[in-house]
Interface confidence: low
């Protein structure tokens, strides 16, 4: 599957990148789908996670593959191309002025990426502008070795950021999840994602989302009124991909946000979340870093109860057991807690209305020198029917103006040993966290404690 190397900004001539889409602007490259599919797909999905250092789990509790290990394996697998959609890059300790041994895994990853370029494997990175990591040199280092980097000006285009975190490798393998390209995501922040191997149909579908970012990364790009047909998705909530994952009948599709970055056939991220919630009959378990039934980045903030209402409706109207596990760290905005208490106040076991909210507090311990770390950064939801793994926090802006993706997977129980479906694996990981000593009920988390571990 040979991908022509896309031009970097320096090679792009203004005449090649008209500001107006009426004059035509095609993707930098198009996947050679027929060629890619000559190799038979044998899709496999592996849940991956990062557990912050010094956060021991109970012996024998379920776990997923370590994220750092999975990323290094994916890069070892690469033969032709690695495409990375990322919010920002900060893979080395000096990026943020920190000297800590826990940055070594990130530094090893950066080294591996440089080796990749040395092996003449194409690396294309779409990253956000504006960015969080203004002092990071990772992308300059990679660009100097031949990586193609485009900054996607989401601020100008939608008043948001590119918050996605996914990889497409050789048009066959995928990583997506909550982890940024940041060393802290590997050792200091709790993350959850998925790696899908040998699945060109899904990989090339996610590649189309990467392409939406790529074409918007040229100077003067504007959002098209209608995306050209070659960006369209054939997989969505009405027509998901059907395949065997390790022999298990599976349906899956990728969703995207904001709506302006959803070409024809692409399910909107919010719609995907609501559909998964709406189909639940037994339970909805969600683990998210932030939960605000408001806007977060517009002033004054607006009330936005869409997800809140869906959880309430499921619990109250259908007797679905709702559990919400929310991140709680030194940078958590305390104005979130009244909303969490309000949601939990709906709970009325006598009337078969079950809503429970806890916060997950990662003890800082002796890691206080590392800013913006020691927090549950996950963004996933699981029901008895489906698993949803996303890149968005739960407030309006992440669905209306910020670029993100979601993965919805459903596997059929019964065709394999109990406990093997993706949704069952994800439920076990959720319940491990929910029942751990780091998950604190709201009653035990009085305002003013500032998410400091009291253990």
């Amino acid at each position: 599957w040979q991908v022509p190397r896309p031009p970097t900004w320096g090679q792009v001539q203004p005449k090649d990148v008209p500001r107006s889409w009426e004059h035509g602007s095609s993707p930098a490259w198009e996947p050679l789908e027929a060629e890619a599919r000559q190799q038979r797909d044998s899709c496999q999905l592996v849940l991956v996670e990062s557990i912050p250092q010094d956060l021991p789990s109970a012996a024998g509790s379920p776990s997923a593959q370590p994220l750092g290990q999975a990323w290094l394996q994916l890069l070892d697998t690469a033969q032709e191309s690695v495409h990375v959609a990322s919010y920002y890059w900060s893979l080395t300790g000096p990026d943020i002025g920190v000297n800590d041994s826990s940055s070594q895994l990130g530094e090893a990853l950066l080294q591996k990426l440089q080796q990749l370029l040395g092996r003449n494997i194409s690396l294309a990175v779409a990253t956000s502008s504006p960015t969080l990591a203004r002092t990071s040199t990772d992308l300059q280092v990679l660009a100097a070795r031949g990586a193609h980097v485009r900054q996607v000006p989401m601020g100008r285009l939608t008043r948001g950021v590119l918050h996605s975190k996914f990889w497409v490798v050789d048009g066959r393998h995928i990583y997506m999840g909550s982890a940024n390209m940041d060393w802290r995501s590997l050792t200091q922040v709790k993350e959850l994602g998925a790696v899908i191997y040998n699945c060109s149909h899904l990989a090339q579908d996610l590649e189309k989302t990467f392409q939406t970012y790529w074409v918007l990364g040229v100077p003067k790009a504007v959002l098209p009124k209608t995306w050209p047909q070659n960006f369209s998705s054939h997989f969505n909530r009405f027509q998901p991909f059907h395949g065997l994952f390790d022999g298990v009948p599976t349906t899956a599709y990728f969703s995207a946000s904001p709506p302006a970055l959803c070409p024809q056939g692409r399910t909107r991220d919010l719609e995907a979340l609501l559909a998964v919630m709406g189909s639940a009959q037994e339970f909805i378990y969600a683990s998210v870093m932030e939960y605000f039934p408001t806007t977060r980045f517009s002033h004054p903030p607006r009330y936005w109860p869409v997800l809140d209402n869906a959880l309430r409706a499921a619990a109250f109207g259908k007797g679905v057991r709702v559990r919400l596990l929310v991140g709680c760290g030194l940078n958590t905005d305390p104005t979130m807690f009244p909303y969490l208490r309000s949601l939990q106040a709906l709970s009325n076991p006598a009337a078969n209305v079950s809503v429970d909210v806890k916060v997950f507090i990662v003890p800082v311990g002796n890691h206080s020198n590392i800013p913006f770390s020691r927090v549950n950064h996950s963004k996933f939801m699981v029901t008895e029917k489906a698993a949803y793994i996303g890149t968005s926090n739960w407030s309006e802006d992440y669905f209306s103006s910020t670029a993100g993706v979601g993965l919805v997977v459903t596997q059929s129980p019964g065709a394999q040993p109990a406990g093997a479906t993706v949704q069952e694996q994800l439920r076990q990981l959720f319940e491990r966290d929910w029942s751990s000593r780091y998950a604190v009920g709201l009653d035990g988390q009085a305002p003013g404690q500032d998410c400091v571990w009291q253990g």
Partner: antibody
Amino acid sequence: EVQLQQSGTVLSRPGASVTMSCKASGDSFTTYWMHWVKQRPGQGLEWIGAIYPGNSETSYNQKFKGKAKLTAVTSASTAYMEFTSLTNEDSAVYYCTGGYSDFDYWGQGTTLTVSS
Amino acid sequence: DILMTQSPSSMSVSLGDTVSITCHASQGIRSNIGWLQQKPGKSFKGLIFHGTNLEDGVPSRFSGRGSGADYSLTINSLESEDFADYYCVQYVQFPPTFGSGTKLEIR
């Protein structure tokens, strides 16, 4: 919020060149286009051109090609416009403007008077 | 280049009135339009971006609407500080082009 601070009033002779500046503060200077706009009384607003400081790409109104030259120094978060071969027609107020939606934030304007 | 036709060129109105200013583009501009305010002897202030969105700090009595090639700025319940010149600007493609302006005067 972005603030744009422009250089002061300029008085110049026909045939001369002048450079005016626009210093940005409050947001990442490299992530939005910086535009320059001309306003003459009774003549409406004319777009001169724009520069994308992130990679120094420029785009000019055909009318001002060869007349205006746009540059930017990212380390100083400052955009510059050099105006050459001045004539009386160049007497006007010149504004820099930028932001994620192109015309969100405006400088206070630089008045250029060309007189012999 | 896209021609932006703005109307009216001026209007005399009273405090408390509601006024609308329109801009017609010579082709569809997909809401890539901004509205600007300029007070006499002063610089410009962005009011609306992307057709309908208020810039930070702009009072909610200002609103924008429209689609395709036709857009409008409405000011409800005019206050004394609203008497100024107003311009539309399209930025769907380079070169950006401006409307000719509307002068709002006190009757």
